[in-house]
């Protein structure tokens, strides 16, 4: 190889070893017959040299360096060439570098041609290895703009003061052309600005200089972005820390069309503007920081350009100014994305808020819309306290559990409505009686309606599930000891065809010490399936519950064990079960840590089956299934 | 697994000489430099010479010409320092070290002391 | 002989300051930098080769640059482990390799 660099060409050239490897033989430079690992080629000089392996490749890189001087003298703006072609040099991993010197009051602009450029961040890398570092300076100090591959929307960077732009290239890469020109600008007054090119929909993620260590002191850059007008940008913030300012304040800017506030000013953990239509710029804004403790201010931020979506355009009001404790929050369900660019899915407070969530209060109106692709890829939730504080009064007192129908006006589904029920401790239980008899969900008989009731305790220290349950079953009522949870969780979009089958009213009934008791009264065409709860972890420790089943007089009830014995053993305690006949009071008392369960057994009235646990051990853990069916009576056997 | 280990460092009186030997496992001396740096007690380090065993190619530090030589044997993969002439200034821990990415390798060192 | 001018001798760091040794070159070495750390009783560690390309396995809160003539080794977020002392080398091909007079990092 021979390189000859021109005296006037301001370049230098340096060989030198790239990553170490783990190749078995290494490999040098070779300058008349003197091995070296690194050359310096200056200007006026030239030099020969061949390699000391076939691949130096994989052992060298090389760095190809243009100082140019714009303060001594006119500056060469235009399309900036790469010199010596590459044609010219070792097939090595190249690395072009300008080094543009400049008086403050200069503003050089950096254009690049289509395809313009994506900025990446740390640990990520460009598909085809082409990099561009960009990097500006504030006196002495080099400031890091950013690394940027290709296929992006960055069209133009303008800086003051000096460029350092280099462009990395893999060995086997075919490139000859720099793919960008520089021209001169007026001071922009500003450490940089970015503009970011939308011709369709798309996102773009930036960040703030020297991300993601800290943004220069008091600094401000600016990124412009260009949006068809027929589109719009939502702004979120990916990533950020704030700095310990001493005099001023870190903010965001934003230029917005049509805006009668201009700029709008934003804190970096306020929810950032959505929704935009046409061209806005984003202005970063630091502060005076603490010497002694400054911290960092660093952020990484996406805009999402999509089109307007027809529900975009319209107004939905939630009313919940007459609810109390009420809380309604607007998310997107978790589902795996597989297409390679997702709109954004947002939803917004009074048209300009946009968040990918967004939760709602008692106590107001709300006015909110839609800026998304596909309202499937929302849902709600929304929880609500119902509390009662003096026993006294709230004694006898009911509640219907209903989704208010101004929920069903909302254009996104309902996932979960949960009531959490609040009593004072030992004083008050309660009872819960649906609309349509319910149906506890198990795998031998699994609901399949849009919608089932979850049923859970509320204390934080309690682990207990009752089940879930659906219309459609033979339960006609649930007692609970103390606080609850209950959710309506929906499964299928007909659920607001189905709404009308929804329905459960509570009500605060005198303390009672059982955990929970069923009432049940089974269908005479269908089996009723019944589980403890807490079904696969296990009844709590020293837990009771009963199932109170009613036996119409015409009938005869058939009591089935789901296995010959529990399992269960007991670490302290016994755990048994009683089986007794409401008319006559005969009970029957199993131990279920020792006896086998009962085989199947007759009941001609209404009996009672109640279950109490010991203290398990682990992994012997107490679980019941049984079920009870219905047979007419042949004979009378009163 | 590269490993660098000196030998022949020992208590010799000043004008004597002694020969400090540097064996490398895990890669090929031929086709890396061998350097030899000291370090005198409480002092920083001193590049006192290397050898490219591919071209033969010797150099040395001023405060060291004339009196020390650096050999290799590629078949034994093991550096050399013969040092003649010593004096007490030359008393310091020695070490070998392999060069390619800098001096990328290093061995423990030996101690070389010079005194009557 | 190429003189190598490491500032400063040493220095006072508390765990997490960043911190900055230079080294100045009496000429021109290209980027034929090293910087070395090395623990009391031990041999020193290759860190950075080449003034700016960090050695494999070394953490990356170690940086080099190169201005010139001048070489700059940063830690960026000093660990306990850094306490040491740290020297510059240089090794362009034509001259005899020379060393910095090493800096020591101590705890303050």
């Known amino acids: 190889f021979e390189i000859a660099l021109p005296r006037e060409s301001n370049i230098t050239v340096l060989i030198k070893l790239g990553t170490p490897t783990l190749l078995a033989k290494p490999c040098y430079i070779v300058i008349s017959k003197r091995h070296t690992t690194m050359l310096s080629i200056k200007p006026g000089e030239r030099i020969l040299f061949t390699f000391s392996c076939q691949s130096p490749e994989n052992h060298f890189v090389i760095e190809i360096q243009k100082n140019i001087d714009c303060m001594s003298g006119p500056c060469p703006f235009g399309e900036v060439q790469l010199q010596p072609s590459t044609s010219l040099l070792p097939t090595l991993n190249r690395t072009f570098i300008w080094d543009v010197k400049a008086h403050k009051s200069i503003g050089l602009e950096l254009q690049f041609s289509i395809p313009r450029l994506r900025q990446f961040g740390p640990g990520e890398s460009c598909p085809d290895g082409v990099t561009y570092s960009i990097s500006g300076r504030i006196d002495a100090t080099v400031v890091r703009i950013g690394t940027f591959c290709s296929n992006g929307t960055v069209s133009r960077i303008k800086m003051q003061e000096g460029v350092k732009m280099a462009l990395h290239l893999p060995w086997f890469h075919p490139r000859n052309v720099s793919g960008f020109s520089i021209a001169n600008r007026s001071s922009i007054k500003r450490l940089c600005i970015i503009e970011s090119v939308f011709e369709g929909e798309g996102s773009a993620t930036l960040m703030s200089a020297n991300y993601p260590e800290g943004f220069p002191e008091d600094e401000l850059m600016t990124w412009q972005f260009v949006i068809p007008a027929h589109l719009r940008a939502s702004v979120s913030f990916l990533n950020f820390n704030l700095s310990n300012c001493e005099r001023k304040e870190e903010r965001v800017e934003y230029y917005i069309p049509g805006s009668t506030t201009n700029p709008e000013v934003f804190k970096l953990e306020d929810k950032q503007p959505g929704n935009m239509a046409g061209n806005f710029n984003l202005s970063l804004q630091g502060c005076d920081q603490d010497a002694q403790n400054p911290g960092i201010l660093r952020l990484q931020f996406q805009v999402l350009v999509q089109h307007p979506q027809n529900e975009s355009n319209k107004i939905y009001v939630v009313d919940l100014s007459n609810e109390r404790a009420t809380s309604l929050t607007i998310e997107p369900r978790p589902v795996k994305q597989s297409r390679k660019f997702v709109p954004g899915c947002f939803v917004c407070l009074e048209s300009r808020t946009c968040s990918t969530n967004l939760t709602l209060t008692s106590g107001s109106k709300h006015k909110i819309s839609f800026l998304c692709d596909n309202l499937t890829r929302l849902w709600m939730n929304v929880e609500k306290n119902i509390s009662c504080t003096d026993h006294r009064y709230c004694q006898r007192k009911s509640y219907s559990l209903q989704v208010p129908s101004d929920i069903f006006h909302l254009p996104v589904e309902l996932h979960d409505f949960s009531w959490k029920l609040l009593v004072p401790k030992d004083r008050l239980s309660l009872v819960l009686v649906p609309a349509q008899k319910l149906q506890q969900h198990t795998h031998e008989k699994p609901c399949n309606t849009s919608f089932s009731y979850l049923v859970a305790s509320a204390i934080p220290s309690q682990d207990l599930y009752f089940g879930s349950f659906c219309p459609g079953g033979s339960i006609e009522q649930i007692q609970v000891k103390q606080n609850i949870s209950v959710t309506l969780r929906t499964f299928a979009p007909s659920f607001r065809q189905e709404a009308s089958r929804q329905g459960l009213t509570v009500s605060f009934i005198p303390y009672f010490k059982e955990e929970g008791v069923f009432t049940v009264t089974p269908d005479t065409k269908s089996k009723v399936y019944l589980r403890t709860p807490n079904w696969d972890r296990g009844l709590p420790s020293l837990t009771s519950v009963s199932w109170n089943i009613s036996v119409p007089r015409d009938q005869v009830a058939c009591l089935t064990f789901f296995k010959e014995r529990t399992g269960v053993v007991c670490q302290t305690g016994r755990a048994f079960m009683i089986i007794q006949e409401q008319r006559t009071r005969a009970e029957e008392i199993f131990s279920l840590d020792e006896d086998a369960l009962p085989k199947p057994r007759f009941h001609h009235h209404s009996f009672w089956v109640n279950i109490s646990n010991c203290s398990p051990a682990s992994g012997k853990q107490l679980d019941l299934l049984f079920w009870v069916t219905l047979t007419p009576r042949t004979v009378d056997l009163t | 697994e590269v490993q660098l280990v000196e030998s022949g460092g020992g208590l010799v009186q000043p004008g004597g000489s002694l020969r400090l030997s540097c064996a490398a496992s895990g890669f090929n001396i031929s086709y890396y430099s061998m350097h030899w740096v000291r370090q005198a007690p409480g002092k920083g380090l001193e590049w006192v010479a290397s050898i490219s065993p591919y071209s033969g190619y010797t150099s040395y530090a001023d405060s060291v010409k004339g009196r020390f030589t650096i050999s290799a044997d590629t078949s034994k993969n093991t550096a050399y320092l013969q040092m003649n002439s010593l004096r007490a200034e030359d008393t310091a821990v020695y070490y070998c070290?392999?060069?390619?990415?800098?001096?990328?390798?290093w061995g423990q060192g030996t101690l070389v002391t010079v005194s009557s | 002989d190429i003189q190598m001018t490491q500032s400063p001798s040493s220095l006072s760091a508390s765990v997490g300051d960043r911190v900055t040794i230079t080294c100045r070159a009496s000429q021109s070495v290209s980027s034929a930098v090293a910087w070395y750390q090395q623990k009391p009783g031990k041999a020193p560690k290759l860190l950075i080769y080449?003034?700016?390309s960090l050695y494999s396995g070394v953490p990356s809160r170690f940086s080099g640059s190169r201005s010139g003539t001048d070489f700059t080794l940063t830690i960026s977020s000093l660990q306990p482990e850094d306490f040491a002392t740290y020297y510059c080398q240089q090794y362009y091909y034509f001259y005899p390799f020379t060393f910095g007079q090493g800096t020591k990092v101590e705890i303050k």
């Open positions: 080449s003034a700016s």
């Open positions: 070290a392999r060069g390619y990415y800098a001096l990328d390798y």
